[in-house]
């Protein structure tokens, strides 16, 4: 059984407040920003977790080359308007009547705009590469053995299903890791490869979301494995629509 | 689903040796930080022995060069070595693993700790 259980605390997402009020007087926890109720046992979606952390106080080469259309997240953070399912709402706006369309990692996929600005469907993000570079170590690792390791980390930490890991490509020092996940292939109950993304993400910058001080210890026989730069990039099953203004 | 089962426990006199076991399943014990913990009755639960991912091993102090933690990878298994009990010893010993991957910080906190076997009495008598 969890801590859940014990202490009322939230294994997966220490950013929400838990008391012993649910059914039975089962331990139940809800987002901080949002107040709602988060399952334990399985990872927050990114879009509750950023309201919460904008609620909280402030504080032959394998490596893949992203296509013309990959995203990445340049905007920062945002307070994001999440549905009732904990998704991103198409479309978002702040406080002075700015508004955008977002793709399913919350990442902006069209310039901006006003409150006119009609976002018609959430677009997915289908395939994720996670690129990072690892500090210096003895020797590369093996590749084989950094491919387990990390497609290991993917399911039991992140409860990422296995088939959603397409590749794990290593050119010492770059790792290059790909996420994919079509509409048609995510099942109830699947976890997002957004939402594994972005708490991987949050880990290797020393900022995990997991309940407990210890952080991500993540290593290869034996050997540490930490990483210096992290570079995120999402393909949209339907490309973004940016203006040319924005190329030049 | 994670699960932890202790064996093990039992009544010793002092002086005496038992070994705990804990048969983990659903995580690689391996991977994550794991540990030993004991609640004598009307006493918080205490820290007893924690093993990291890199095989590094710490011991309360008031049980150091008495209490061994150690890890089986093949069998998935961690063990706590008890000898030269104390009756100060007798108390509920619980196993316990971090979410995976996670490290281990010092002070020992249960609140570090997701996941908890149902526990093993240990009774030293003097």
């Known amino acids: 059984h969890t801590a859940a259980q014990d202490n009322c605390t939230c294994p997966t997402n220490k950013m929400t407040v838990c008391s012993p009020d649910g059914p039975g007087g089962r331990c139940q926890c809800r987002a901080l920003g949002s107040g709602v109720a988060v399952d334990c046992s399985t990872l927050t979606s990114k879009c509750l977790l950023l309201k919460a952390r904008m609620s909280a106080p402030k504080n032959a080469r394998t490596l893949v080359r992203p296509n013309e259309h990959a995203l990445v997240d340049n905007d920062g953070l945002y307070d994001p308007d999440c549905d009732p399912e904990g998704r991103f709402k198409a479309r978002q706006c702040n406080q002075t009547s700015v508004c955008w369309c977002v793709n399913s990692v919350g990442v902006r996929r069209t310039d901006k705009g006003d409150l006119s600005l009609r976002c018609d469907e959430l677009v997915r993000t289908h395939h994720i590469l996670i690129d990072l570079r690892h500090r210096p170590t003895a020797g590369a690792f093996n590749h084989s053995d950094l491919d387990a390791e990390l497609r290991r980390l993917f399911r039991e930490r992140y409860r990422l299903h296995p088939k959603f890991v397409a590749a794990v490509h290593y050119e010492q020092p770059t790792i290059q890791i790909e996420l994919r996940q079509n509409t048609s292939q995510k099942a109830a109950g699947d976890v997002d490869i957004g939402d594994a993304a972005y708490y991987f993400e949050r880990d290797v910058k020393g900022e995990s979301l997991f309940q407990g001080r210890g952080g991500l210890d993540l290593r290869v026989r034996g050997e540490p494995l930490q990483v210096e730069r992290t570079l995120i990039y999402y393909l949209d099953e339907i490309p973004p629509k940016f203006s040319m203004k924005r190329l030049t | 689903q994670v699960q932890l089962q202790e064996s093990g426990g039992g009544s010793v006199q002092a002086g005496g040796s038992l070994r705990l076991s804990c048969a983990v399943s659903g995580l690689t014990s391996s991977t994550t930080c794991m540990g030993w913990f004991r609640q004598a009755p009307g006493k918080e639960r205490e820290g007893v022995a924690v093993i990291r991912s890199s095989g590094e091993t710490t011991a309360a102090d008031s049980v150091k060069g008495r209490f061994t933690i150690s890890r089986d990878n093949a069998k998935n298994t961690l063990s706590l070595q008890m000898t030269s009990l104390k009756p100060e010893d007798t108390a509920m010993y619980y196993c316990?693993?971090?979410?995976?991957?996670?490290?281990?910080?010092?002070?020992?906190?249960?609140?570090?700790?997701?996941?908890w076997g149902q526990g093993t009495q240990v009774t030293v008598s003097s």
């Open positions: 316990a693993a971090a979410w995976p991957y996670s490290g281990c910080l010092l002070p020992l906190s249960s609140g570090d700790f997701t996941y």
